[in-house]
């Protein structure tokens, strides 16, 4: 397969509701009509798949399986949102992009986005 450049932000802070969003941008060398995007999480040298989506150019992303991710695509950019994050999910989230059709097949892997998740403090009981 051929290499392709993928850019993503270095750091993102998740919201208090455990939602993190970031843009994954790829430098498409050709006119791809089918694109696959996979988000991988790297922590303690372990790499696990978070979610995966596939889409036809100009159409919306279809996330596979029961996904914690949602997203939209625009040109060579994919806007990804990961939900339900907790402090233990803090880690490096890597965007992998594959141009599946037509050949040649291109593969690009970003450097990763460090997502920091801080669990909200429980509200103290208040007596009035």
């Amino acid at each position: 397969c051929k290499a392709m450049h993928v850019a993503q932000p270095a750091v993102v802070l998740a919201s208090s509701r455990g939602i993190a969003s970031f843009v994954c941008e790829y430098a498409s060398p050709g006119k791809a009509t089918e694109v696959r995007v996979t988000v991988l999480r790297q922590a303690d040298s372990q790499v696990t798949e978070v979610c995966a989506a596939t889409y036809m150019m100009g159409n919306e992303l279809t996330f596979l399986d029961d996904s914690i991710c949602t997203g939209t695509s625009s040109g060579n950019q994919v806007n990804l949102t990961i939900q339900g994050l907790r402090a233990m999910d803090t880690g490096l989230y890597i965007c992998k992009v594959e141009l599946m059709y037509p050949p040649p097949y291109y593969l690009g892997i970003g450097n990763g986005t460090q997502i920091y998740v801080i669990d909200p403090e429980p509200c103290p009981d208040s007596d009035f």
Epitope: G30, E34, E49, A52, T54, L64, E98, Y101, P102, P103
Partner: antibody
Framework: QVKLQESGAELVRPGASVTLSCKAS????????MHWMKQTPVHGLEWIGV????????TYNQKFKGKATLTADKSSSTAYMEFLSLTSEDSAVYYC????????????????WGQGTSVTVSS | DIVMTQTTASLSASVGETVTITCRAS??????LAWYQQKQGRSPQLLVY???TLGDGVPSRFSGSGSGTQYSLKINSLQPEDFGSYYC?????????FGGGTKLEIK
């Protein structure tokens, strides 16, 4: 009906090259990818690579890069695979196969296969 | 590369029996899986794609199931013409590798 007609069996000497052909009929040649497979008793079925006859775009299995060269001739609806510098390891049955219709995310399938070409490398 | 493992290399069964052939992927392939049948000296024939969709003209006694890394092909009420070799193939990331095959023989 869809048919992929492959060329006949080949007996070739080590170090030589061979070109296999696959003539497509019964559908629009440029609307479907053409893939090539290798089958041996030891390694089973292996995916060699794919060519898009419309654009000429190619993806090879890294294992076969430099060993196989894929081409397609739109005018005759024929796909070709040249296999270079043959050794006994290249003795196998080779198949051309068509991948299901383009422009649908889920059509990942080899829906039609040629009858296979047997290649024997021997001195 | 994704490794496809068919742990049962050969299987013997009688006409009328039900058999299940399994295939394991080394990583999640998200149902991007096909099953093929191959008779001796013939080319493979498509049975199932997208893990569970039957190919055109494939009898309903064949069914595919599974998800993630584990997939299976079930054949209900085996017929004489069902004996042969069965292969799984993934379509997740290239190269699109095959399982080693399961040979189904008559008992």
């Amino acid at each position: 009906q869809v048919k992929l007609q492959e060329s006949g069996a080949e007996l070739v000497r080590p170090g030589a090259s061979v070109t296999l052909s696959c003539k497509a009929s019964g559908y629009t040649f440029t609307d479907y990818e053409m893939h090539w497979m290798k089958q041996t008793p030891v390694h089973g079925l292996e995916w060699i690579g794919v060519i898009d006859p419309e654009t000429g775009g190619i993806t090879y299995n890294q294992k076969f890069k430099g060993k196989a060269t894929l081409t397609a001739d739109k005018s005759s609806s024929t796909a070709y695979m040249e296999f270079l510098s043959l050794t006994s390891e290249d003795s196998a049955v080779y198949y051309c196969t068509r991948r299901g219709a383009r422009a649908t995310v889920y059509n990942y399938v080899m829906d039609y296969w040629g009858q296979g070409t047997s290649v024997t490398v021997s001195s | 590369d994704i490794v496809m493992t068919q742990t049962t290399a050969s299987l013997s069964a009688s006409v009328g029996e039900t058999v299940t052939i399994t295939c394991r992927a080394s990583e999640n392939i998200h149902n991007y899986l096909a099953w093929y049948q191959q008779k001796q000296g013939r080319s493979p024939q498509l049975l199932v794609y997208n893990a569970k969709t039957l190919g055109d003209g494939v009898p309903s006694r064949f069914s595919g199931s599974g998800s993630g890394t584990q997939y299976s092909l079930k054949i209900n009420s085996l017929q004489p013409e069902d004996f042969g070799s069965y292969y799984c193939q993934h379509f997740w990331s290239t190269p699109w590798t095959f399982g080693g095959g399961t040979k189904l023989e008559i008992k």
